[in-house]
Structures are given as C-alpha cells and as structure tokens.
C-alpha cells in the first residue's frame, strides 16, 4: 500500500521523492500531481522540472532540496485540509515507458487549538476570521472570533509530522528512490 | 494493509436495538475518523455518522440523531454503531468506513453487515 | 441537506464506447466531490476525490470534473470491468450525502 505522511493544518507538508542522476548536472524532467499517477505524465500538475530548472509551479508548492543533486521533493505550503490526498511523483526517465512513478498519501491533520470558547456555526462564505479545526472542511470549521490577530504558524510550530515519527533521514529509503544510469 | 471487518448484524425484532462493531487493522484508528454508511436493499448509500476516536467527538446525519450512537473503542482498535428503535426501514447493510484522513471521503471500506427488521 | 441528482439512473455501454455520468448538487459544493463504483456483490470503492483526482490503483480511463454544483464522470472506454453502480458525493458539508447511483451495464 501507498506511503502515508501527515501534516497539521497550518504547517508545510513535505513529500519526499528522490533520483540520482548520472552524471552532475543531467538532470532528469520530472512532474508532481495531484491525483494517483496516470499511464502517462501527471494529472492535475503542481510542479514541473525539465533538464534544467523547474519550468513550472503553483502556488504553495515548491522544491525545498537540491533537485540538481535528485531531491526532488516537494514541499507544500502552509496545508489545509483541502491539501489531503495522493500525490504523484514522476521521474521522467527517456525511453518508452521508463518512468518511475511514486504514489504519495497525504494527510492533513485538523489543528487542535483550545482558546477561548468557540462557537461551532453553519458555513459561509462571508466568515470575517477562520481558522481550521478538527473537522472535514467548510462544514465544520469554527470561528475564533474573540481572538486578537494571529497566524497560523504562531499556533503550531511543531515540524513536518510524519507517519510513525519517521525521520526526514531516513526517507531516503522509504522506497521513492531511484538511481540512473 | 488496511482491513474493516463489521460484525454483529442479524434479524432483530421492530423496536429492538442493535450493536454492531467494526475490528481495524492496518491503521490506528485515533489517526483519522471512522464513518458508518448504510444501503437498504436495492438502493442507494446514506451516511449515518462518523467518529473521531482521539477524542470522542461525534456528528450524525440528521435523520440518525437520537436514534444512532457511534461509539470507538481505542484500546481495541474498534468502532461501534448502536442503533435503536429500530424498524422496518432500518433494514440494511452496514458499512464501516475509514475516511482518507479527516476528510469526508471513503477510501476504505469494510465488508457489510447485514440488519433485517422483521417480526 | 444537500441533495445530489445523478443522471442517468442507468445507463447502457458498449465495450470499448466512452460513457459520460452527470451529478447535479442543490448548492454550490466547491470541488468538494467524490465518485464510487459499487461492483456487483461488493463494497463501493473510491474512484476520484476533490472533483477530478483519481484515487490510486485506478484506471486513467476513468475521469472527474466540475466545480459548484455541476460534475461529471467520464470513463473514456468502457470494459466489461466497469458494470456496477456509480455514486457521486459531495463532502462539503454534513450531513454528507450520496447520488441516487447511476448503473452501468454492458449493452
């Protein structure tokens, strides 16, 4: 079954995928999606790197490590629940069905804040102030209306939260590795 | 791997109640919510309610409310649906189902157990 | 509640012929949809997620799109694999609620 990592709202995400390249500098294209990886390419595309430099992103999502070295991990941004789901990394490898494609399971964690009573009211779009807590999306978020102006990151600094407090280190060998040439 | 095994449905008698479990495996339930689903024969999927085991918290589909209680078991692994009142229109099977993680879509499902309502 | 409105409630396919599910929701739902096949005699299984994200282990045959109250699941070539029932649901808000099905059945 897929890997799984976990992060909290609020917090960066962090979806290890790595290469070797062959030689220093011969980089291999690769793409990131949202959605299971398909027969070809990938769907919903966050992130795209070509032989030489990343040629195309969105917002939120980047590579954090050294993709010319074969880290191309990818980070994402300040997560929301909305962020939960598979991730596709794909090593685009020449050759006719030669790719190494990578399934990645996110899952975003409600942030637990226990301020000040709150209130649990029907979404609107029309909320002055909101912040995510345990729930599923819009239908379940509360307002922290009496709370002075703070962001997210204040809440919870904590790192990335990986499955079974695995170490960053020791993703490497979590199977999204592959070696070229 | 992730596993769903519900047990404890059967024939009961209109107005009686009903407690069915629901065995995990493969995940630590505390991790993500657990949802009960039902389907009357020959028809289609409603949701009854889900759980977050951490701590408790519940929420019912409105219909359910009074007349369903969801209920986790950590230390077993395990989720409950007790049902109550029951009648002739709860005949169904029952699915347990763990979400994605926190977010109101199945990726997982359990077998079915199967609730008649009958005298 | 929201209320989903799939169509058609059946529908027959030939192998190997594109074949197209529509789901209506009563209000605006985002991209918050989801799509399940129910083989016969099984459980329902995840096919796509948010609208247009195909779950893993799921054929690339198989596409969502939309967004507010409109959705639509393509297959663009049907197998004899894909006989069952098709369910839309939205996730948006509570109480989460299910398309009537839509079944698909080879001609």
């Known amino acids: 079954s897929e890997v799984e990592y976990r992060a909290e709202v609020g917090q960066n995400a962090y979806l290890p995928c790595f290469y070797t390249p062959a030689a220093p500098g011969n980089l291999v294209p690769v793409c990131w999606g949202k959605g299971a990886c398909p027969v070809f390419e990938c769907g919903n595309v966050v992130l795209r790197t070509d032989e030489r430099d990343v040629n195309y992103w969105t917002s939120r999502y980047w590579l954090n490590g050294d993709f010319r070295k074969g880290d191309v991990s990818l980070t994402i941004e300040n997560v929301t629940l909305a962020d939960s789901g598979i991730y596709c990394c794909r090593i685009q490898i020449p050759g006719i069905m030669n790719d190494e494609k990578f399934n990645l399971k996110l899952v975003i964690k409600p942030a637990k804040v226990t301020p000040a009573p709150t209130r649990q009211r029907d979404f609107t779009a029309a909320f002055p102030r909101m912040l995510t807590t345990r729930g599923h999306g819009p239908a379940e978020t509360q307002t922290l209306g009496s709370l002075p102006d703070i962001n997210l990151t204040q809440i919870s600094t904590l790192a990335n939260e990986l499955r079974d407090s695995r170490l960053a280190n020791d993703l490497r060998d979590s199977g999204a590795t592959i070696r070229i040439g | 791997e992730v596993q769903l095994v519900e047990s404890g449905g059967g024939l009961v008698q209109p107005g009686g109640s009903l407690r069915l479990s629901c065995a995990a495996s493969?995940?630590?339930?505390?991790?993500?919510?657990m949802h009960w689903v039902r389907q009357a024969p020959g028809k289609g999927l409603e949701w009854v309610g889900r759980?977050?085991?951490?701590?408790?918290?519940?929420k019912y589909a409105p219909k359910f409310q009074g007349k369903a209680t969801i209920s986790a078991d950590t230390s077993k692994n395990t989720a409950y649906l007790q049902m109550n009142s029951l009648r002739a229109e709860d005949t169904a099977v029952y699915y347990c189902?763990?979400?994605?993680?926190?977010?109101?879509?199945?990726?997982?499902w359990g077998q079915g157990t199967l609730v008649t309502v009958s005298s | 509640d929201i209320v989903m409105t799939q169509s058609p409630l059946s529908l027959p396919v030939t192998p190997g012929e594109p074949a197209s599910i529509s789901c209506r929701a009563s209000q605006s739902v985002d991209n918050y949809v989801a799509w399940y096949l129910q083989k016969p005699g099984q459980s329902p299984q995840l096919l796509i997620y948010y609208a247009s994200n195909r779950y893993i282990g799921v054929p690339d045959r198989f596409s969502g799109s939309g967004s507010g109250t409109d959705f639509t699941l393509k297959i663009s070539r049907v197998e004899a694999e894909d006989v069952g029932v098709y369910y839309c649901?939205?996730?948006?808000?509570?109480?989460?609620?299910f398309g009537q099905g839509t079944k698909v059945e080879i001609k």
């Open positions: 493969g995940f630590n339930i505390k991790t993500t919510y």
């Open positions: 649901q939205q996730h948006y808000s509570s109480p989460y609620t």
């Open positions: 759980i977050d085991p951490a701590d408790d918290n519940t």
């Open positions: 189902v763990r979400d994605f993680g926190y977010v109101a879509w199945f990726a997982y």
